[in-house]
């Protein structure tokens, strides 16, 4: 079976690498534009230059192309705690990241939010905070993990998953409650 190709891929595959088929004349292969530039005019004929122009400020192309317009530079999303790691250039998009001691949580493929790395208070660091993953904490005895924080077993309700980890404490609390009856 031959995989289905889109029109643009079909047109490009007839020409050697680094060239594309002239949209009005499929016997002509034009040279693609370098990264940092975009297609202003197709080449007039075989062996003749493609008219490529540099991307304007606020736009870029990161690879060789025959795009009619450069791509708009991304903006770092302040409301998500993002900071600019490197600014947009004609051949590279803005790079956004997080501050020191923060990690990225991806809500979707193209949206991340910065959160503070957990400090593992009342516990120990099992795995250090990574660029895209929070610290993994192991809690001390008498504490259980909730929302990546070590919480005292006195806050453990019977209905919660903490009951196994906090079983001795819960039994103690139950015992003291029962012993007070007459």
């Amino acid at each position: 079976l031959v995989p289905h190709l889109g029109d643009r891929e079909k047109r490009d595959s007839v020409c050697p690498q680094g060239k594309y088929i002239h949209p009005q004349n499929n016997s002509i292969c034009c040279t693609k534009c370098h990264k940092g530039t975009y297609l202003y005019n197709d080449c007039p004929g075989p062996g003749q230059d493609t008219d490529c122009r540099e991307c304007e400020s606020g736009s870029f192309t990161a690879s060789e192309n025959h795009l009619r317009h450069c791509l708009s530079c991304s903006k770092c999303r302040k409301e998500m705690g993002q900071v600019e790691i490197s600014s947009c250039t004609v051949d590279r998009d803005t790079v956004c990241g997080c501050r020191k001691n923060q990690y990225r949580h991806y809500w979707s493929e193209n949206l991340f939010q910065c959160f503070n790395c957990s400090l593992c208070l009342n516990g120990t660091v099992h795995l250090s905070c990574q660029e895209k993953q929070n610290t993994v904490c192991t809690c001390h005895a008498g504490f259980f993990l909730r929302e990546n924080e070590c919480v005292s077993c006195s806050n453990c309700k019977k209905s919660l998953e903490c009951t196994k980890l906090c079983l001795p404490q819960i039994e103690n609390v139950k015992g003291t409650e029962d012993s007070g009856t007459t």
Epitope: R77, F115, E147
Partner: nanobody
Framework: EVQLLESGGGLVQAGGSLRLSCAAS????????MVWVRQAPGKGLEWVSH????????FYADSVKGRFTISRDNSKNTLYLQMNSLRAEDTAVYSC????????????WGQGTLVTVSS
């Protein structure tokens, strides 16, 4: 006490439109980034859109870009989601939420409103 109450859901034919509202109370609405999320039957939570406090430069998931518009009225403490050119795959429970601050979970979000798109 934070309260978020969605309305405006319902049954609509493919290609149709709906406008969802989210009435907020119990916090300073004008200071918070607000989010629309959705959960389709048997699927996980999907981030649909969010809007910063000043209403500028909202974010849209690729799946809704060009069809949905998020907006807010800070004087009415209300968040909106205008949904046009609806598709069967937009069928879900839509909830509004406050942008999380402490970690990647929603501390405050509404019960949701069901949107059903029939083809």
């Amino acid at each position: 006490e934070v309260q978020l109450l969605e309305s405006g859901g319902g049954l609509v034919q493919a290609g149709g439109s709906l406008r969802l509202s989210c009435a907020a109370s119990g916090f300073t609405f004008a200071h918070e980034t607000m989010v629309w999320v959705r959960q389709a039957p048997g699927k996980g939570l999907e981030w649909v859109s969010h809007i910063p406090p000043d209403g500028q430069d909202p974010f849209y998931a690729d799946s809704v870009k060009g069809r949905f518009t998020i907006s807010r009225d800070n004087s009415k403490n209300t968040l909106y989601l205008q949904m046009n050119s609806l598709r069967a795959e937009d069928t879900a429970v839509y909830s509004c939420a406050l942008l999380p601050k402490r970690g990647p979970w929603f501390d405050y979000w509404g019960q949701g409103t069901l949107v059903t798109v029939s083809s």
